[in-house]
């Protein structure tokens, strides 16, 4: 799997999309996990509803939400109030039994808020030793959500 890069601005929301074959993964729950080192395990952050038929319902774990369009074949993860420590390598997964198939590898990069004049030295970017060949960059710089606003995925 190639790695897709999603960039978001610190303090704002970042939406990550993972397309998949809706028939191949029919009936399977999905998950979002964080890779612990390039060869390490992938630690589950959040998974879709326990009942696959209700996968469209958004589920939250802390500031991370997941929702699955099982007909269209798109898994959407929202990272709300993005922080420097959210940067890193993640995976979208399709679950069957205790197994997980990787749908997409995702590198999250956190950009400094241009309106925030604090030191950006702690913002994380992959160093030379962590370069990701053939990584595809998707800029997903979004505004902060208003109080009570539902973070719907883009309709395009």
């Amino acid at each position: 799997h190639n790695t897709t890069v999603f960039q978001g601005v610190a303090g704002q929301s970042l939406q990550v999309s993972c397309p998949y074959d809706s028939m191949k993964h029919w009936g399977r729950r999905k998950a979002w996990c964080r890779q612990l080192g390039e060869k390490g395990p992938c630690q589950r952050v959040v998974s879709t509803h326990n009942l696959w038929l209700l996968s469209f319902l958004r589920r939250w774990n802390g500031s991370t939400a997941i929702t699955d369009d099982t007909l269209g074949g798109t898994l959407t993860i929202t990272l709300r109030n993005l922080q420097p420590h959210d940067a890193g390598l993640y995976q979208c997964q399709s679950l069957h039994g205790s197994e997980a198939d990787t749908l997409r590898k995702v590198l999250v990069e956190v950009l400094a808020d241009p309106l925030d004049h604090r030191d950006a030295g702690d913002l994380w970017f992959p160093g030379e030793s962590e370069s990701f060949e053939d990584a595809h960059v998707e800029h997903s710089i979004s505004r902060s959500l208003l109080e009570g606003e539902i973070p719907f995925p883009p309709t395009s």
Epitope: D21, K24, G97, S98
Partner: antibody
């Protein structure tokens, strides 16, 4: 009606090659995984591997990796199991089975099976 | 690989009897277990999936229970057509593995 129809019995000599088939009908062949299962004479069932005909994504059991090749031709709704060099120990009944994901528990079970292909390898 | 162990390996019973077959997994498999029936010269037939869900068209005298490592298949009142070999199968992880089978014979 969902059906998996397998090719007929084969008698081969050690070292020969063989390709057996499993043709699906009555459902969308490209939308379900197909597994191959071996049953040696008088023995239990052994899962060999699986293929998704839609994109030919294939998984093998470690026991069969490198020993057999699983493939599919979605244009004719057929999955295949092949050997490049048969051994006497390959003598068995081979079943193909459709794998269905049941959304209740997001796991996979074999809901339809072919009638089996008996492969006999003897010098 | 997960090992599946069935007991007994064979059982003799009469029409009308209640029969229980057990299956034990070498590690926890949640409820990811299926039961199949196979008659001589025929392909296996799915009876139970997800440990306790009855497959369409399977008579209600068949039932399954259990989770984790211990599972049972129960036939509440044996019918002549039930004499066959029964296999359990885990759907937890690859490779999928089957029990060695339980042969149900007429007493």
């Amino acid at each position: 009606e969902v059906q998996l129809v397998q090719s007929g019995a084969e008698v081969k000599k050690p070292g020969e090659s063989l390709k057996i088939s499993c043709k699906g009908s009555g459902y969308s062949f490209t939308s379900y995984w197909i597994a191959w299962v071996r049953q040696m004479p008088g023995k239990g069932l052994e899962w060999m591997g699986i293929i998704y005909p839609g994109d030919s994504d294939t998984r093998y059991s470690n026991s069969f990796q490198g020993q057999v090749t699983i493939s599919a031709d979605k244009s004719i709704s057929t999955a295949y199991l092949q050997w490049s060099s048969l051994k006497a120990s390959d003598t068995a009944m081979y079943f193909c089975a459709r794998q269905r994901t049941f959304y209740y528990d997001s796991s996979d079970y074999f809901d339809y099976w072919g009638q089996g292909t008996l492969v006999t390898v003897s010098s | 690989d997960i090992q599946m162990t069935q007991s007994p390996s064979s059982v003799s019973a009469s029409v009308g009897d209640r029969v229980t077959i057990t299956c034990r997994a070498s590690q926890g498999i949640s409820s990811w277990l299926a039961w199949y029936q196979q008659k001589p010269g025929k392909a296996p037939k799915l009876l139970i999936y997800a440990a306790s869900s009855l497959q369409n068209g399977v008579p209600s005298r068949f039932s399954g229970s259990g989770s984790g490592t211990d599972f049972t298949l129960t036939i509440s009142s044996l019918q002549p057509e039930d004499f066959a070999t029964y296999f359990c199968q885990q759907a937890d992880s690859f490779p999928r593995t089957f029990g060695q089978g339980t042969k149900l014979e007429i007493k």
